[in-house]
């Protein structure tokens, strides 16, 4: 068929909950390409009808929900003007009741369901929720040993659980839970995460580098919407938290009631030697009280700020 096989990806998944896989392989998928999903070498593509339990949504294959019989190899075919590439995804579905201790241990879970916290440090766990734009995710709840996590050492920030002053007792089995809404229907997503601890620094004591901002001011009109990215480079297995703060408080907490200023979801691009992280801050409406206040981007021990200022009056208008 003239298609070049790129790689095989193995995913081990829990039945009875949504799952999605995005067919991306930069730089191939960054150009003008068409993406088509197939199951088990079938010639018939996966349905694109959004009411179907299994359907293709743009470049994604979406299972609403995953069922035990969905195990198998799925192919994603990426066709360009002069090229054809194929990615194989081997899905293994298992029945797991996270809080049923009578059931044996978990299968060999993929790496994002195994995470490490660093003893004595402020660290975080990430709830990996990869879904297309058509899926709306509600707030995330976190559990340890089947009990909802509460306490001043723990803060939920977007898809992360921040853990301050990690102790040996923080190791064990965690789960993050969110409600996913798609076409008016609601589904529960529950990811189990096995969390181990280490004393090792892990990133060799490297200091993250904030590329932007650079401790500068930004001219912005009163009442406008403003989005500012914080771009950070760091080593691949760093344990640094990246966030926006104002008056030494997380912006999401500081503006908890009005939600006028919010931190965005962190994204990252992986390079050979490092990762480039981006986390933005959104001002839905710039108010007078925002001017002159340093909004700080934090990345581990590194910080950089922006200060909003009113544009200089344009006297030519008079």
């Amino acid at each position: 068929d003239g298609c070049k096989d790129i790689f095989m990806k193995n995913e081990i998944l829990s039945a009875s909950q949504p799952f999605a896989f995005n067919c991306t392989f930069p730089p191939i998928t960054s150009g003008e390409v068409s993406v088509t999903w197939y199951k088990n070498s079938s010639k018939i593509p996966v349905s694109k009808i959004i009411q179907s339990r299994i359907h293709q949504d743009e470049t994604w294959i979406l299972f609403l929900p995953m069922e035990w019989g969905d195990s198998g190899v799925y192919q994603c075919v990426i066709k360009g003007r002069d090229s054809c590439h194929r990615i194989h995804v081997n899905l293994t579905v298992f029945e797991k009741h996270w809080c049923d201790t009578s059931i044996g241990g978990l299968p060999n879970l993929s790496d994002e369901y195994k995470q490490i916290l660093h003893l004595g440090k402020d660290d975080s766990l990430t709830c990996h929720l990869h879904f297309p734009k058509s899926c709306v995710l509600g707030p995330i709840k976190w559990y340890k040993d089947c009990n909802e996590i509460k306490g001043e050492r723990f803060t939920v920030l977007e898809t992360r659980l921040l853990v301050s002053n990690v102790s040996a007792e923080d190791r064990g089995n965690y789960a993050c839970q969110a409600i996913l809404t798609h076409s008016g229907k609601q589904y529960e997503v529950l990811n189990g995460i096995t969390v181990s601890i280490t004393e090792r620094a892990g990133y060799g004591g490297s200091v993250p580098k904030i590329i932007y901002p650079k401790n500068h001011s930004i001219e912005v009109q009163l009442g406008t919407t403003l989005i500012v990215d914080c771009n950070v480079t760091d080593t691949k297995d760093n344990t640094n938290l990246r966030c926006w703060r104002v008056n030494n408080t997380l912006v999401d907490d500081y503006y908890d009631e009005s939600k006028r200023i919010r931190e965005g979801v962190e994204t990252h691009v992986s390079f050979r030697e490092h990762n480039l992280y981006t986390v933005n801050i959104t001002f839905l409406e710039v108010k007078m009280e925002d001017y002159g206040l340093p909004f700080m981007c934090h990345a581990g021990v590194s910080t950089a700020y922006i200060i909003l200022q009113l544009p200089a009056p344009d006297f030519r208008a008079y």
Epitope: D111, R171, G172, V195, T198
Partner: antibody
Amino acid sequence: EVQLQQSGPSLVKPSQTLSLTCSVTGASITSGYWNWIRNFPGNKLEYMGYISYSGYTYYNPSLKSRISITRDTSKNQYYLQLISVTTEDTATYYCATGGYDYVEDALYYWGQGTSVTVSS
Amino acid sequence: EILLTQSPAIMSATLGEKVTMSCRASSNVRYMYWYQLKSGASPKLWIYLTSNLASGVPARFSGSGSGTSYSLTISSVEAEDAATYFCQQFTTSPYTFGGGTKLEIK
């Protein structure tokens, strides 16, 4: 059950390179920390270094200019290279990993050890 | 570098005797790990996070300590306990082992 199987020569000539392989079954080397330790004659243990889940390497500063730890995730193997060996590098070399009771630093799983003699 | 000094270097005990071996650190250590090494075998994790016994380790063993002073105790020595015991720290790099305590049974 995690198992570590070591392979490599037991005799290396001075100034040459010592190369050892640790083949892992029952776990993926893309999670956790994968260590090398050696035991000198007379029972003196030295921690040599590790390669982490992301490929980050840590080396004992006493070996830094001579040691290299690499991996092949497709084979689920990791490797130790020690260049310019001398008779002082004669030891039993072990690969080991932790993760016991969710503690990465508790080195519970060990290879069988490779006794390496440096001699001409 | 954190130096771990184990004492005594060699100790001899009679069956049923209580023995304690010490591991002193040159700087504060958060947790101590202990390994048992017998001739011709690979080291075995014996005690982790200062006081937790690894799987298969008899309950007569215990670990304790904090800061710079740690110890491993056997409440009633048995013949199979004859081995060399090493302490190790991961608190500060370079990660180091103690010189070992060799336990002999009279």
